[in-house]
Amino acid sequence: AILGRSETQECLFFNANWERDRTNQTGVEPCYGDKDKRRHCFATWKNISGSIEIVKQGCWLDDINCYDRTDCIEKKDSPEVYFCCCEGNMCNEKFSYFPEMEVTQPTSNPVTPKPP
């Protein structure tokens, strides 16, 4: 391991469409990939009238957008589906939204997902 880098070996797994996809609904996912490539965790969610609905969480393949991010934060302004990625085991347990476009002080409540 490179000093200062959080290697990702496992991520929180969640799938809202677990029945359709024939997967578990929630659990811990071991992350696989080419040995020399980095691995990350991700979270996707929707904001339906202020209510957070988690879509999926799991492992994400080598992506420079995720490098050295210990926190899972979506920065895109008002996406249809929110997405964030991070490095470090289970780093996708919590996720936040801090839009970069915002001129005024952004507000965000970190979300600790509670599967239904």
Epitope: V55, K56, G58, W60, D63, I64, N65, F83
Partner: antibody, heavy 115, light 111 residues
Framework: QVQLVQSGAEVKKPGASVKVSCKAS????????INWVRQAPGQGLEWMGT????????SYAQKFQGRVTMTRDESISTAYMELSRLRSDDTAVYYC????????WGQGTLVTVSS | QSALTQPASVSGSPGQSITISCTGT?????????VNWYQQHPGKAPKLMIY???KRESGVSNRFSGSKSGNTASLTISGLQAEDEADYYC???????????FGGGTKLTVL
Amino acid sequence: QVQLVQSGAEVKKPGASVKVSCKASGYTFTSSYINWVRQAPGQGLEWMGTINAVSGSTSYAQKFQGRVTMTRDESISTAYMELSRLRSDDTAVYYCARGGWFDYWGQGTLVTVSS
Amino acid sequence: QSALTQPASVSGSPGQSITISCTGTSSDVGSYNYVNWYQQHPGKAPKLMIYGVSKRESGVSNRFSGSKSGNTASLTISGLQAEDEADYYCGTFAGGKYYGVFGGGTKLTVL
């Protein structure tokens, strides 16, 4: 092993649309991006755009904005690229590739636009 | 984002070393370690050889190496072999906030 299998060759008339599919296997489809690249006969590679396979978020090359639509169906691990208002200079082999590094490629789909 | 600049062709004899350059700007090649190199044989799909400037893709011969200086990335092939004859493209990472771009390609001829 990772595989990306694309749909077969298409012949289209100018002004029509074409939709190319890319079925992924051997990895978790929703764990990366799918990029689309085309190559006109005897020419180089041209990046068209990318889709995040889990969120559906897309980014398109400026040249194709308004004419290309990238979608995916997670339930069948398949990505799609639709190009509309086809012209003769859209004749090319269209490739899908996995991830931001393009580490695995489909076999290519030849789209011929001819009147 | 404008295309990256590569020489149209290079050549070398078996056993020699050759280098292919890929020049961008300070805002793409110069700023990030996200340049990749692809090999394409006629009628085949491209194959990733080097990613992130200098990381060799799994299964790729150690005769292939990548480096970067300023706004120029380079692919070096040592101990040239007949099967290395192909087109080589440089390109950038694409996904999220990063937009992709390729070089025009370089035809490598093994004499």
